[in-house]
C-alpha cells in the first residue's frame, strides 16, 4: 500500500489511492452557435457537443447548458481552442487625426462560476487584436493550464463575438478538462 | 487496496491501480523534411526525432514513419507545435477589381489513423490566414487536447506547406502524447 | 496491489504507486516586471505571483527568484502563455533599397537550469513576427509539452523584451508545471 | 423565444425621412451583429446595411445604394436596432426587415415594415 | 462587391423530379448560404455554410459547391416545396444576395 516500502523517503502524507480510468475527464467539440440569452455585461457563452464525434463526457463530470460541472475537488487541467473567422478588418485604415483606430480583437475566456460567489472568475484569457487586410481571416486562440476546483463549480468558454467563431468542424473548436 | 477504508464514498468502480512512471508517453522534435510521398487529397506528414535531445519515447509507445503508435487504450492527451516561416505574402496587394485575395494560409492537423477504419481522423486542427506585408514572417501554431484512443491507433501531425516549416531548433516543432 | 491480478498482462516493471494528489505541482500568474539583471546574451527572466489569485504551490514544487524548483524527477507538463502588447509596428514600411526589413518580434521560451550544467536547455519556444499596420496591437503566445526533469533542475520563462509583456490580469499571463 | 418586431414605416416623399426601429427579444441583443434586409414587391432580398457590437465600436457597414443616405445604429440597453433613412428615392420602396447575423446565416427575421416613397 | 447570379431565374417542376439550382459568385466565397421564401412570407434560412440544412429544412434538400460556384438540390420535390430560393454571400462586404430563382409546380 501506498506509504510502504515503494514510498519514496520524503513522502509523508498518505493520500487515497486513485485509478486513472475513473477521473473525472471531458471534451466537447463546437456545434452552430444560435442567438441565446446571456448573462448581461458579460461575454457570450458557447454551447457545445458533449457526446457526438470525437466529444465525450465520463466519470461523472457533466455537461449541461453550456457549463461543464466539476463532480470532485482537486487540480484540474482545462483547455480550449476557439478558431475565429471574419471579414477585412477595418483597423488599417487612414488614422483620423493622427490617432491609431481601436483595433478589432477577438477574446476567449474559460470562466469558473461558484454558486456561493457573486462573480465569475475568469481563470484563462486569449486575446488578440485582428488587423488584417486585403482578405477574409481565420485564426485559432489556444489556451491551458491547471486550476485546483471545486466540487460544484462551473466552467464555461466566452468568446467576445460570437458571430465570428468557426463551428464547422469538431476539430477547430473545442473545450475540454481533466482531473488530473 | 483501492475500494477500501480511502475510497471516495462515490467511487464504485474498482480499475485496477497504475504506476505513473510506467504509462505510455513520448515527446518528439522536429528535424529537417525530406520530400516523400503523401496521400492523394492529404497534407504532408511530418517526421520526427524520438531519441535524441529532448525527444524520448517510453513504456511501449514508440515511434515508427512518422507515426506514433499508441500501446495501450485509454484516454491520451496529444499535442504539437509547428513553427512556420515564409516570405512575404501577397494576400495584401491592391485587390484587382475590388476583390479580396484568397488568403494565404497554414494549417496544422493531428490526425489518428486506425487500421479498420478506411478514413484517417482528424483529431485536431488549427489553422490561420498568412497575410503579412512588407517582410519576412514565422509564427507558431500550438495544439493540445484530449482523445480516447484504442491500442493500435497511429497518430501523425500533417501540415498544409511541408516547406514552411522551421525544423532549425527542436523547442520550435514538437510533438507528444501521453496515457493519462 | 500494482502487479497482482489487476496489473495488464504487458506490464512487467513493479513501479511504486503514487497518490495524484501529493504530486509536485504550480500555477504562477503574472505580475508587473520591475527592471532586473539578466544574463548577457539571454532574454530576461520573467518573476511571478505563487500565491495569491489562482496562484499555488503545492508538494514540495517552490518558486523562487524566477524559477520553480523541481522537487522530485519525473515527467512534467510544463506551460506558459504570455500576452504581449504594443505599438504599431514599423516593419511594414516601405523597404530601402528593395530589401524587406527584419520585422519586429515576439519570443517565449521556457527554459530549464540544471547546477551542473554550463549552459541552460530551452526546452520550449514560441516566436512570432509583428507587423500589425494602423494601431496598436496584443496577442498571446501559448507554449506547452512534456519533459523529463530531474530533482533541482529549474524552469524560467524568458521573454525577448519584458516592456511588451500584458502583466495586467492573471488569466493572460501565466506560467505552471505538474508532475504527470 | 427569439422574437423581431420592426416598426417605423409608412408613406414619405422622396426627399423625405423616416426612422425604423428593430425591438428584440429572447436573446442578448448585445451580443449580435445586427443587419436590415429589404425587399421591392415583386422583386428579390437585398441587403441594406449592418452593425456590429460594442467591442468593435459600433462598425458598421452599407450596401453601395444606401451608403451615404442611410445610417444604422443601435440601443443595447433597449434592445433595439434603428435605420435612420434620409435622402429617400422612390427606388427605396419596400418592406424593411432586420435579422441578427451569425457568420452562417440568418436564423431569425421580423414580420417586416413597409416603407412607401411616393408623391 | 460580390455578384451572385442564380440560374435559372424560374423553373417549372413536376414533382418528384430532381432539382438544380445553382449560384455563380463574381468572385470565391468562403460559405454561401441559401434562404427559402414564400409569398407573403418573410424568408427563412435554408441552407447554411454551403452543405448544412437549417432546423426543420427536409433532408430532400442538400447544397454542394466551393470557391464561385455553388448548389442546391432537392432530389425529389414536393409540392410545399415551391417557394422563392435566394443564395446569400457573407465572406466580403457589401453582402449580397443573388436575384432569386422561382420554382412553380406543375
Known amino acids: 500500500l501506498k506509504g510502504q516500502e515503494f514510498a519514496p523517503s520524503h513522502q509523508q502524507v498518505y493520500a487515497p489511492l486513485r485509478a486513472d480510468g475513473d477521473k473525472p475527464r471531458a471534451h466537447l467539440t463546437v456545434v452552430r452557435q444560435t442567438p441565446t440569452q446571456h448573462f448581461k455585461n458579460q461575454f457570450p457563452a458557447l454551447h457545445w457537443e458533449h457526446e457526438l464525434g470525437l466529444a465525450f463526457t465520463k466519470n461523472r463530470m457533466n455537461y449541461t447548458n453550456k457549463f461543464l460541472l466539476i463532480p470532485e475537488s482537486g487540480d484540474y487541467f482545462i483547455y480550449s481552442q476557439v478558431t475565429f473567422r471574419g471579414m477585412t478588418s477595418e483597423c488599417s485604415e487612414i488614422r483620423q487625426a493622427g490617432r491609431p483606430n481601436k483595433p478589432d480583437s477577438i477574446t476567449v475566456v474559460i470562466t469558473k462560476v461558484t454558486d456561493s460567489y457573486p462573480e465569475p472568475t475568469q481563470l484563462l484569457m486569449g486575446t488578440k487584436s485582428v488587423c488584417e487586410v486585403g482578405s477574409n481571416w481565420f485564426q485559432p486562440i489556444y489556451l491551458g493550464a491547471m486550476f485546483s476546483l471545486q466540487e460544484g463549480d462551473k466552467l464555461m468558454v466566452n468568446v467576445s463575438d460570437i458571430s465570428l467563431v468557426d463551428y464547422t468542424k469538431e476539430d477547430k473548436t473545442f473545450f475540454g478538462a481533466f482531473l488530473l | 487496496l483501492k475500494g477500501q477504508e480511502f475510497a471516495p464514498s462515490h467511487q464504485q468502480v474498482y480499475a485496477p491501480l497504475r504506476a505513473d512512471g510506467d504509462k505510455p508517453r513520448a515527446h518528439l522534435t522536429v528535424v529537417r523534411q525530406t520530400p516523400t510521398q503523401h496521400f492523394k487529397n492529404q497534407f504532408p506528414a511530418l517526421h520526427w526525432e524520438h531519441e535524441l535531445g529532448l525527444a524520448f519515447t517510453k513504456n511501449r509507445m514508440n515511434y515508427t514513419n512518422k507515426f506514433l503508435l499508441i500501446p495501450e487504450s485509454g484516454d491520451y492527451f496529444i499535442y504539437s507545435q509547428v513553427t512556420f516561416r515564409g516570405m512575404t505574402s501577397e494576400c495584401s496587394e491592391i485587390r484587382q477589381a475590388g476583390r479580396p485575395n484568397k488568403p494565404d494560409s497554414i494549417t496544422v492537423v493531428i490526425t489518428k489513423v486506425t487500421d479498420s477504419y478506411p478514413e484517417p481522423t482528424q483529431l485536431l486542427m488549427g489553422t490561420k490566414s498568412v497575410c503579412e506585408v512588407g517582410s519576412n514572417w514565422f509564427q507558431p501554431i500550438y495544439l493540445g487536447a484530449m482523445f480516447s484512443l484504442q491500442e493500435g491507433d497511429k497518430l501523425m501531425v500533417n501540415v498544409s506547406d511541408i516547406s514552411l516549416v522551421d525544423y532549425t531548433k527542436e523547442d520550435k516543432t514538437f510533438f507528444g502524447a501521453f496515457l493519462l | 496491489l500494482k502487479g497482482q491480478e489487476f496489473a495488464p498482462s504487458h506490464q512487467q516493471v513493479y513501479a511504486p504507486l503514487r497518490a495524484d494528489g501529493d504530486k509536485p505541482r504550480a500555477h504562477l500568474t503574472v505580475v508587473r516586471q520591475t527592471p532586473t539583471q539578466h544574463f548577457k546574451n539571454q532574454f530576461p527572466a520573467l518573476h511571478w505571483e505563487h500565491e495569491l489569485g489562482l496562484a499555488f504551490t503545492k508538494n514540495r514544487m517552490n518558486y523562487t527568484n524566477k524559477f520553480l524548483l523541481i522537487p522530485e524527477s519525473g515527467d512534467y507538463f510544463i506551460y506558459s502563455q504570455v500576452t504581449f502588447r504594443g505599438m504599431t509596428s514599423e516593419c511594414s514600411e516601405i523597404r530601402q533599397a528593395g530589401r524587406p526589413n527584419k520585422p519586429d518580434s515576439i519570443t517565449v521560451v521556457i527554459t530549464k537550469v540544471t547546477d551542473s550544467y554550463p549552459e541552460p536547455t530551452q526546452l520550449l519556444m514560441g516566436t512570432k513576427s509583428v507587423c500589425e499596420v494602423g494601431s496598436n496591437w496584443f496577442q498571446p503566445i501559448y507554449l506547452g509539452a512534456m519533459f523529463s526533469l530531474q530533482e533541482g533542475d529549474k524552469l524560467m520563462v524568458n521573454v525577448s523584451d519584458i516592456s511588451l509583456v500584458d502583466y495586467t490580469k492573471e488569466d493572460k499571463t501565466f506560467f505552471g508545471a505538474f508532475l504527470l | 423565444e427569439v422574437q423581431l418586431v420592426e416598426s417605423g414605416g409608412g408613406l414619405v416623399q422622396p426627399g423625405g425621412s423616416l426612422k425604423l426601429s428593430c425591438a428584440a427579444s429572447?436573446?442578448?441583443?448585445?451580443?449580435?451583429?445586427m443587419n436590415w434586409v429589404r425587399q421591392a414587391s415583386g422583386k428579390g432580398l437585398e441587403w441594406v446595411g449592418g452593425?456590429?457590437?460594442?467591442?468593435?465600436?459600433?462598425?458598421?457597414q452599407y450596401a453601395e445604394s444606401v451608403k451615404g443616405r442611410f445610417t444604422i445604429s443601435r440601443d443595447d440597453s433597449k434592445n433595439t436596432a434603428y435605420l435612420q433613412m434620409n435622402s429617400l428615392k422612390t427606388e427605396d420602396t419596400a418592406v424593411y426587415y432586420c435579422?441578427?447575423?451569425?457568420?452562417?446565416?440568418?436564423?431569425?427575421w421580423g414580420q417586416g415594415t413597409t416603407v412607401t416613397v411616393s408623391s | 462587391e460580390i455578384v451572385l447570379t442564380q440560374s435559372p431565374d424560374f423553373q417549372s417542376v413536376t414533382p418528384k423530379e430532381k432539382v438544380t439550382i445553382t449560384c455563380s459568385a463574381s468572385?470565391?466565397?468562403?460559405?454561401m448560404h441559401w434562404y427559402q421564401q414564400k409569398p407573403d412570407q418573410s424568408p427563412k434560412l435554408w441552407i447554411y455554410?454551403?452543405?448544412n440544412l437549417a432546423s426543420g429544412v427536409p433532408s430532400r434538400f442538400s447544397g454542394s459547391g466551393s470557391g464561385t460556384d455553388f448548389t442546391l438540390t432537392i432530389n425529389s420535390l414536393e409540392a410545399e416545396d415551391a417557394a422563392t430560393y435566394y443564395c446569400?454571400?457573407?465572406?466580403?462586404?457589401?453582402?449580397?444576395f443573388g436575384q432569386g430563382t422561382k420554382l412553380e409546380i406543375k
Open positions: 429572447g436573446f442578448t441583443f448585445s451580443n449580435y451583429w
Open positions: 452593425i456590429r457590437l460594442k467591442s468593435n465600436n459600433y462598425k458598421t
Open positions: 446569400f454571400q457573407e465572406s466580403g462586404y457589401p453582402f449580397t
Open positions: 468572385s470565391s466565397v468562403s460559405y
Open positions: 455554410d454551403t452543405s
Open positions: 435579422t441578427p447575423l451569425l457568420l452562417s446565416g440568418m436564423d431569425y
